[in-house]
Interface confidence: low
């Protein structure tokens, strides 16, 4: 039977009356146009909504915007447009919300053509009040907050100037000209690239990478011949042009650019690209594009230094620079990532890794699903997940996969069951164990969201017709109840719930359309009365993550340790609550060779876990650079996988080799670096 239709599904008692008492409608006094929504702070209940409407005139576009504020999670809104002097706000800059619970908001206004600079509205009290500030420049990008100090802002101007404010946008100072890209690093450091000749585009590959650690008082050039740079975890990456040709290579620094090493990754040509797929303080996933317009490349995973890379996955789907990839970090279970590969026959298949890129496998076929027309064998096939690429291709996929760190093990995604992704109408599937097993959750495409740390899942059918029904489940998607939230259906545009999945409120956004007018409308539903009581100890059960063989002593060991979680029983209908903290008990595993990767100059033969010296490197100088200068490299051929916590067991100690090598990279060597002060 279809999910939610079998006899085992008990109905939540009196839910219609309970939800009806907690459904709040707000009709916005607005023509339709566009709407954007931002949460201000965590657990504050403050939402800002900006509606904009463009009236196309013969010569120009006249625009108007309205600003609304809620402080009760969207149940009621107040029009606060007068606080920004009824100014038209530029939606392309969005609402710049400050980090953590700073309560800071910056809105960028539209100004008339002849003005000397732009205009912003600033609030530091969760949008209760705004201060208008005229800028000495026209902003090109949204204001960027320093992660460490929300009073520090940076922005690029339309004339490529780098502007910094130390007092939350009250005063601005241009600290450098001819800037292409600027990013905050740690400790209020700013990294940026500059051009010397014509422009960012003309100087691509000849840019310089600069750093300032004191907001522009002094600078240090930390790289030359730069194509681009990026930050990931504790790593700073730069792609650097080679001396002799048009290829470029990745260089990495773990000390803010003082010293650099050449990453052991293939070089790329003009038409290729590198992309940091994911990074943390331990390691990085790097995509290296294949030559030619193939639409795929290779994923490499790094060691703890970001220097030595292991090939992780071939034929990884990634269309073009800045294009689409399905690479997804499953945040509900450690070590799990999902992505797509382009197979030899040009079909697209989903792959999953449970050990941070060590091994990839197909997703197990859901037990309640049949293989579709793409399957050669009707009894053997896999689940394939729709993500960014499907959405970019305008397939009937309204949402990317969803997981939340505090909803342990839960992954929700659109998918199809066959030999590869299908362009047929997808269904929605759920995993409750981090991607090991899957079940069809809903027939056809839906919008979905997680509330109360997984205690409630909410879904709305994706339809071109007006809708008035919402579905919800209190048992991780096994059984579904439907609630009619309004008599008058609305054209649905989106679901909004507070980031972090701790809230019990969901807002349904849409518009009503009559013959002459259309208006924005939101319905906020509070599920607190559905989950009447707080969860108690008896409502939780012990769950071993990554468990595949309970008989095995090492069952659940991933990256050197296993974790037991306290998880809510599916049958328990209770509140985890806003203060819910995931309870987990880690235990260290014995080391095996699987806990080590092969160091530079070593590789693993197929079906062998030992690292052996690469024959082609015997007796050769290695093209390997550590800290940008000639150095001896000693290795026993193994390095612990980043983040691996195993102890005891196998210790692959053997003769330490002294790999003498010649440094072939001095693009970023210290001699070429210089410092200067303003």
């Amino acid at each position: 039977s279809a999910p939610g239709e079998d006899e085992e599904c008990g109905r939540v008692r009196d839910f219609v009356a309970k939800l009806a008492n907690n459904t709040h409608q707000h009709v916005f006094d607005d023509l339709r146009g566009s709407v954007s929504l931002s949460w201000v702070g965590d657990s504050t209940g403050v939402i800002l909504v900006l509606t904009t409407f463009h009236v196309p005139l013969v010569i120009m576009t006249f625009g108007q915007s309205k600003l609304y504020r809620s402080e009760d999670y969207g149940k009621n809104f107040k029009d606060i447009t007068d606080l920004i002097n009824n100014t038209f706000i530029r939606t392309e800059f969005g609402m710049a919300i400050g980090p953590e619970n700073s309560g800071k908001v910056v809105l960028t206004a539209e100004v008339s053509g002849g003005s000397r600079g732009g205009r912003i509205f600033r609030s530091s009290d969760f949008a209760k009040n705004f201060v208008q500030t005229d800028l000495p420049f026209h902003p090109l990008t949204q204001m960027m907050y320093s992660p460490q100090n929300s009073d520090y802002l940076l922005a690029l101007s339309t004339e490529n100037g780098l502007w910094v404010s130390k007092n939350f946008g009250g005063k601005w100072e241009e600290i450098h000209k001819a800037v292409c890209l600027a990013k905050w690093g740690s400790d209020n450091t700013i990294f940026f690239t500059t051009y010397a000749n014509g422009s960012c585009k003309a100087d691509l590959g000849a840019l310089e990478l600069w750093r300032t650690s004191d907001l522009g008082k002094s600078f240090k050039t930390i790289g030359v011949k730069i194509y681009s740079f990026g930050l990931g975890g504790r790593f700073l990456f730069a792609s650097v042009m080679a001396d002799k040709d048009t290829t470029r290579r990745i260089h990495v620094s773990t000390d803010q650019g003082d010293t650099w090493s050449m990453a052991q990754l293939p070089s790329v040509g003009q038409e290729q690209f590198y992309s940091i797929l994911a990074a943390n303080d331990d390691m990085v996933f790097m995509h290296v594009d294949e030559p030619g317009d193939t639409g795929f490349g290779t994923i490499f995973t790094s060691d703890d230094r970001g220097i030595v890379y292991s090939k992780s996955l071939d034929r990884h789907l990634y269309t073009t620079t800045g294009g689409e990839t399905d690479f997804t970090n499953v945040t509900s279970l450690r070590g799990v990532y999902i992505t797509s590969v382009l197979s030899e026959d040009n079909s697209i298949q989903t792959m999953i890794t449970f050990d941070q890129g060590g091994r990839w496998t197909h997703l197990r076929k859901p037990e309640n699903s049949e293989c579709d027309a793409t399957a050669k064998n009707k009894n053997e096939c896999s689940l394939h997940i729709h993500a960014s690429y499907s959405i970019s291709q305008k397939l009937n996929v309204p949402m990317a996969p969803l997981s939340e760190p505090n909803a342990v093990g839960i992954v929700i995604a659109h998918g199809s069951v066959g030999d590869a992704i299908s362009v047929m109408v997808p269904d929605v599937y759920i995993s409750d164990d981090g991607g090991y097993s899957w079940t069809k959750m809903l027939e056809g495409p839906h919008y979905y969201t997680i509330l109360d740390s997984g205690g409630i899942i909410v879904a709305i059918e994706h339809s071109s017709r007006p809708i008035n029904v919402i579905k919800f489940s209190t048992d991780e998607g096994q059984c579904w109840q439907t609630y009619t939230f309004t008599r008058d259906p609305i054209y649905f545009t989106g679901l909004a719930s507070e980031p972090g999945a701790r809230s019990m409120n969901i807002s349904i956004w849409g518009f009503t359309e009559s013959f002459l007018t259309s208006q924005w409308v939101s319905y906020t539903i509070d599920f607190k009365d559905i989950l009447e009581r707080n969860c108690e100890e008896k409502d939780y059960t012990i769950w071993l993550a990554h468990s595949t063989d309970p008989e095995d002593y090492e069952d659940g060991c991933i990256l050197g340790y296993k974790e037991q979680f306290l998880r809510l029983r599916k049958s328990s209908v209770c509140q985890n609550g806003r203060d819910y903290v995931v309870t987990k008990q880690p235990s260290i595993c014995l080391c095996s060779l699987e806990d080590f990767l092969c160091d530079f100059g070593y590789y693993r033969p197929e079906n062998d876990s030992k690292c052996v010296e690469q024959p082609e490197l015997k007796g050769h100088d290695l093209e390997f650079c550590l800290y940008g200068r000639e150095e001896h490299l000693t290795t026993n051929g193994y390095r612990k996988i980043p983040g691996d916590k195993c102890q005891g067991g196998v210790n692959p100690v053997r003769e330490v080799k002294d790999l003498k090598k010649k440094c072939t990279s001095n693009f970023l060597s210290p001699e070429k670096q210089n410092s200067k002060s303003n």
């Epitope: 026959d345 040009n346 793409t374 291709q393 009937n396 056809g444």
Partner: antibody, heavy 129, light 107 residues
């Protein structure tokens, strides 16, 4: 077996509307998109648009936008194509065709571009004053 | 929209001979191309999908090749029942578009 059965021939006056039905059987109706294609006498095939039976979302060829409406009734497994403001040049045979290639841009995956694999028998619409 | 151009408009071939039909797209359609056969008074019939894969029940004498912008339908040895009009169609980018057709007639 899988088949599409269309409604019978129609004769209409210029300015009127025509609604052609296409009833699907022998497969899961909601799993496949449906395209409409027409063919004027002695002419080639012309794609009019496509409908997704689950949500009812549609995509029409620009030429027909504003005049064509495609709908579906999932309870009976029937798709409808209505063409309004008829002119004499709309005289043609109208076909519904099961279309697994999907809406908008499909994948770069040859295996999933099935082409229109099942066709209705066609409905002749004559527009004449 | 992507324009599909078929050539020749008419192809005269004797039974038992080989027939080669061409289809050109105004921009790349990857492998998302189908070929149809239509006989007078009948609905079109799918022959080839994905540029080169024969649909269910289609004889081996029909083969498709090409990718990107240039495609070919080959009938290795024409049978009497193969004399018909053949259309190519792309399903890479909406709106789907057909070629103008090639009529294969008895020489």
């Amino acid at each position: 077996q899988v088949q599409l059965v269309q409604s019978g021939a129609e004769v209409k006056k210029p300015g009127a509307s025509v609604k052609v039905s296409c009833k699907a059987s022998g497969y899961t109706f909601t799993k496949y998109y449906m395209s409409w294609v027409r063919q004027a006498p002695g002419q080639g095939l012309e794609w009019m648009g496509i409908i997704n039976p689950i949500g009812g979302s549609t995509s029409y060829a620009r030429k027909f936008q504003g005049r064509v409406t495609m709908t579906r009734d999932t309870s009976t497994g029937t798709v409808y194509m209505e063409l309004s403001s008829l002119r004499s040049e709309d005289t043609a045979v109208y076909y519904c065709a099961r279309d697994p290639s999907g809406i908008a841009a499909a994948y770069p995956a040859s295996r999933y571009n099935y082409g229109m694999d099942v066709w209705g028998q066609g409905t002749t619409v004559t527009v004449s004053s | 929209e992507i324009v599909m151009t078929q050539s020749p408009a008419t192809l005269s071939v004797s039974p038992g001979e080989r027939a080669t039909l061409s289809c050109r797209a105004s921009q790349s359609v990857s492998s998302n191309l189908a070929w149809y056969q239509q006989k007078p008074g009948q609905a079109p019939r799918l022959l080839i999908y994905g540029a080169s894969t024969r649909a269910t029940g289609i004889p081996a004498r029909f083969s498709g090749s090409g990718s990107g912008t240039e495609f070919t339908l080959t009938i290795s040895s024409l049978q009497s029942e193969d004399f018909a009009v053949y259309y190519c169609q792309q399903a890479r980018l909406g709106p789907w578009t057909f070629g103008g057709g090639t009529k294969v007639e008895i020489k």
